[in-house]
Interface confidence: medium
């Protein structure tokens, strides 16, 4: 069985389908360009008690009297945006904790960096691929997941913390990167567009996709995520864009069914378990890999960052329910919760297949112009 | 500010109908679900029915069948319409916007003042 | 249908005291399906607490909101004069089907 959007049809899609960049090209970031804060209108994150900050929450860290192997982390500052004048009371409903707390948005002020510093950093995500500059290392293995079909009990919770939709993952879910790179699962969230807007956070030669799927784990040399956050590999996110296609996405249906209980800002539902690998491409052999960060505050560096080269299908009516489903705080929808692309700053992305023969369709003739960092290894 | 405001409310005899309305002024009713309360004389509060910024519609198994919750959006108005109406009906009918937009949670504000519906012969 | 116990139904304490309403779900339900109301005699109620835990912006710290799964609580720190009133929880599910009751409501009194 063929499998859709292989890369011998071109790189993700080689920008074939999918939006226009809603950026355009003169608006990604160069070489020179300092990190840049979010283009696209966004909400603001007014938390509920347990909301969590970074990509896009990850788990908080509990007291020490609580139990011991659970992994958590500390809320970090995000950054309030002002509330609508209309409507001050009901813009305003914040958890009781809210006084001490600032919040962060995407689109407008307060840039990032005042958030959390490591928002300037010189290696940050998401980044532009391209599959021609990619260096082929053959010492990048397919990816194994292990424990990723999950029995309908117990549920998991699916919530709408104000800037994604997450799905909070149970222990038990391991995932290697490689030999001696073993991680295991937290949570999986998305990042969408608007209508005839694509929203996806990583690019693939300037082209944006509808959608991305982020899997965020944590490295099994720690012990919680506060002692892995900007640690070189202490962190690792797999991520797959997200295509129109002619069929309904069964997987993706599980959850995108069930948007409609978490529309609003801060609530959650609970979903019977499911195959997570379902929501991933069948291809874990083919994939663009680099260190970058968290694509939200504390936008913390050290991030193994895996995006495959296989994109996901989901139907016109799904993609349109992902985008046009879920509301931020106030009267705002929860849409364009991407990060502007981020300056490479010599970074080298490897790719575990030669993405540079044959590959693009904007290609004159092919070209490998950087080698594998990894090769040795 | 936004306030809401019931009217419609009355004397009406069993099996009768009434439709309630419930204005609201400093905010734009559609993107929110809005809900009906009701409490009779001396009790407490009674859930009566819902309808999702969808215009999908729930409703109490008390009610179900008789009553209908619709919405005006172009008057910024919400409607209960209420059909074979019986004693156990009566009560002081409440109207309540969803504290944020879009979805279904169980957290309602602000609340109109009320308005009493008596069924009586 | 899903039923909210809630207990006590009365309760006198005096300006100070700490006071503790419990709210029980015949299911479990999401802690974002949870909220507390607070109605004074011939006015409407009044979101106290949403989501089991967080407050709306204008209702005072001494009110607080707990639980998870099919037991709520609401807790008023240091009551005070203006707490008399009758409070409500409310609970249920939005699914498939959309399932949600008030708890009978417990009438705070100060001595």
């Known amino acids: 069985q063929r499998l859709p959007r292989m890369q011998e049809d071109s790189p993700l899609g080689g920008g074939s389908s999918g939006e226009d960049d809603p950026l355009g090209e003169e608006d990604l970031p160069s070489e020179e360009d300092s990190p840049r804060e979010e283009d696209p209108p966004g909400e603001e994150d007014l938390p509920g008690e347990e909301d969590l900050p970074g990509e896009e929450d990850l788990p908080e860290v509990k007291p020490k009297s609580e139990e011991e192997g659970s992994l958590k982390l500390e809320d970090l500052p995000t950054v309030e945006a002002p509330g609508d004048p209309q409507e001050p009371q009901n813009n305003a409903h914040r958890d009781k904790e809210g006084d001490d707390q600032s919040h962060w948005r995407y689109g407008g002020d307060p840039p990032w960096p005042r958030v959390s510093p490591a928002c300037a950093g010189r290696f940050q995500s998401p980044v532009d691929i391209r599959p021609q500059l990619a260096a082929f290392c053959p010492a990048l293995r397919p990816l194994e997941l292990l424990g990723f079909q999950l029995p309908p009990l117990p549920e998991l919770r699916l919530r709408n913390n104000g800037h994604s939709v997450q799905l909070t993952l149970p222990p038990g879910l391991e995932m290697a990167l490689g030999p001696g790179r073993e991680y295991r699962a937290l949570q999986l969230h998305l990042h969408w567009g608007a209508a005839g807007r694509p929203g996806s956070e990583h690019t693939v030669e300037g082209h944006r996709f509808p959608a991305e799927i982020h899997v965020v784990h944590l490295s099994t040399a720690f012990a919680r995520v506060d002692e892995a956050l900007g640690r070189p590999g202490g962190l690792a996110v797999l991520a797959a864009f997200l295509e129109e296609g002619p069929e309904e996405n069964s997987a993706y249906e599980q959850l995108l069914s069930r948007l409609e209980e978490i529309a609003e800002e801060g609530s959650e539902t609970q979903v019977p378990g499911l195959d997570i690998s379902a929501l991933l491409p069948s291809d874990f052999s083919r994939y663009f890999q680099y260190e970058g960060s968290l694509t939200t505050p504390p936008c913390a560096q050290g991030v193994i960052w895996t995006v495959f080269n296989q994109t996901v299908m989901l139907s016109a009516k799904q993609l349109h329910t992902l985008s046009d489903t879920l509301w931020g705080p106030g009267d705002s929808r929860l849409q364009l919760n991407f990060r502007a692309t981020q300056p490479l700053n010599g970074r080298v992305i490897e790719a575990s297949f030669p993405a540079g023969v044959d590959s693009s369709p904007r290609a004159a003739e092919p070209v490998q112009l950087n080698s594998c960092l990894a090769a040795g290894d | 500010e936004v306030q809401l405001l019931e009217s419609g409310g009355g004397l009406v005899q069993p099996g009768g109908s009434l439709r309630l309305s419930c204005a609201a002024s400093?905010?734009?009713?559609?993107?929110?679900?809005m809900t009906w309360v009701r409490q009779a004389p001396g009790k407490g509060l009674e859930w009566v029915g819902i309808i999702s910024s969808n215009d999908k519609t729930w409703y109490a198994d008390s009610v179900k069948g008789r009553f209908t919750i619709s919405r005006d959006n172009s008057k910024n108005t919400l409607y209960l319409q209420m059909n074979s109406l019986r004693a156990e009906d009566t009560a002081v009918y409440y109207c309540a916007k969803a504290a944020m937009p879009g979805g279904l949670k169980n957290a309602f504000d602000p609340w109109g003042q009320g308005t009493l519906v008596t069924v009586s012969s | 249908d899903i039923q909210m116990t809630q207990s006590p139904s009365f309760l006198s304490a005096s300006v100070g005291d700490r006071v503790t309403i419990t709210c029980q779900a015949s299911q479990t339900i999401g802690g974002s399906d949870l909220s507390w109301y607070q109605q004074k005699p011939g006015k409407a109620p009044k979101l106290l607490i949403y989501?089991?835990?967080n407050l709306p912006s204008g209702v005072p710290s001494r009110f607080s909101g707990s639980g998870s799964g099919t037991d709520f609580t609401l807790t008023i720190s240091s009551l005070q004069c203006e707490d008399a009133a009758t409070y409500y929880c409310?609970?249920?599910?939005?699914?498939?089907?959309?399932?949600?009751?008030f708890g009978g409501g417990t009438k705070v009194e100060i001595k």
């Open positions: 400093g905010i734009d009713l559609s993107n929110y679900a």
């Open positions: 409310l609970g249920g599910y939005a699914a498939a089907s959309y399932r949600t009751a």
């Open positions: 989501y089991a835990t």
